[in-house]
Interface confidence: low
């Protein structure tokens, strides 16, 4: 008799969810030489054990602490960039500028990224099938809490200017339920950090507006300053072009402003 | 904000030197020097990243050097052998990637060379 099994409105676990985190900790551990020592065995050991045979509405950062633990990482505080719903950009800009750091650059965030994964109360299996969505059904879940504990541990290390890319092209260019706007902003310590400096993203090709003067942008600024940390805010009118002179920066079209 | 000062322009002879430099009010990373003809378009003249790397403008190679000093937050360009067509107004630029990405920018300074 096959067992009832909760349905949830998120999809299930991204299949071979084991087998990729265990690859990818490999992969990074033989990439990064200051990580060489994390045995990846352990680390799995500890990612499964945050959530598996218990309740997918019902987790909890100290969960994740013993993987928090394995995974303890020193980034530079201070090449440190957040992103918001820009994250392709923000990962190609860190690819060219290989000194800059977003949280998918460490090793948590790294066997994390575009992956999906939640249990079962009192079973050992994952759950392939459905797991919790943070809008319908819950937001103590396996995926957004994982998030919340690394993220709100990536702002805390931060220091001096903390760069964010945000992306020009929403409606709310800051959105303060996204996990920048909810988690980041809120734990970037002021004695450490000095300035957040925003780069607002453009998307259309003619857009010359200055961003920087959103409301959503003035009521980051307004969060920001009221922690005691500084704010500037840049537009990249042309975020094709930037990222090219990020690589090549005496090239003759980048002598004029992006 | 950082603020880029440029000195160092005048009126000099053909196969004259010059020495520019623009001063940063705050830590910058890459710098470098732009300049602007009358009627023509801004040019790349010199880079200097924030590790030292050097590049040039190929009409400058061998008479131009950029040059810094990251304890005063000064940059240099040492301008010799002069000739009438780097007659233009010297602009300092500073960025964090590369010099001129949308950052910061010098007033700029005259550099008129006489035949």
């Known amino acids: 008799v096959p067992r009832w099994r909760q349905q949830w409105s998120g999809p299930g676990t991204t299949k071979r969810f084991p087998e990729t985190v265990l690859a990818r900790c490999v992969k990074y551990t033989e990439i990064h030489p200051e990580m060489r020592h994390v045995d990846c065995q352990s680390v799995w050991d500890a990612f499964k054990g945050a959530f598996i045979s218990k309740h997918p509405c019902n987790i909890t950062e100290e969960d994740y602490q013993p993987l928090m633990k394995l995974g303890t990482q020193t980034v530079p505080c201070n090449k440190i960039l957040l992103w918001s719903r820009i994250k392709d950009l923000a990962h190609q800009f860190t690819q060219v500028q290989r000194d800059m750091f977003t949280l998918e650059d460490t090793l948590l965030g790294y066997l994390a990224d575009d992956l999906t994964w939640c249990g079962e109360f009192n079973t050992s299996k994952i759950n392939y099938q459905s797991c919790p969505d943070w809008r319908k059904d819950c937001s103590n879940n396996p995926v957004s809490v994982f998030w919340k504990t690394v993220s709100r541990r990536f702002a805390e290390a931060a220091c001096d200017v903390v760069h964010v890319m945000l992306n020009g092209s929403r409606s709310k260019i800051f959105d303060k339920n996204s996990t920048f706007g909810s988690v980041e902003v809120h734990n970037l310590q002021p004695e450490k950090v000095q300035t957040l400096e925003a780069w607002v993203i453009h998307g259309g090709r003619e857009d010359s507006r200055d961003l920087c003067q959103d409301p959503t942008i003035k009521e980051l600024e307004s969060i920001i300053s009221k922690r005691n940390i500084q704010f500037s805010c840049k537009n990249i009118y042309r975020p094709d072009k930037f990222l090219q002179c990020v690589k090549n920066p005496e090239d003759s079209s980048c002598t004029s402003e992006i | 904000e950082v603020q880029l000062v440029e000195s160092g322009g005048g009126l000099v002879q053909a196969g004259g030197s010059l020495r520019l430099s623009c001063a940063a009010s705050?830590?910058?990373?890459?710098m470098g020097w732009y300049r602007q003809a009358p009627g023509k378009q801004r040019d790349l003249v010199a880079t200097?990243?924030?590790?030292?790397?050097?590049k040039y403008a190929d009409s400058v190679k061998g008479r131009f050097t950029i040059s810094r000093d990251n304890a005063k937050n000064t940059m240099y360009l040492q301008m010799n052998s002069l000739k009438p067509e780097d007659t233009a107004v010297y602009y300092c630029?500073?960025?964090?990637?590369?010099?001129?990405?949308?950052?910061?920018w010098g007033q700029g300074t005259q550099v008129t060379v006489s035949s």
């Open positions: 630029a500073a960025g964090k990637w590369f010099p001129a990405a949308n950052e910061y």
């Open positions: 705050g830590r910058t990373y890459a």
């Open positions: 200097i990243s924030g590790a030292g790397n050097t």
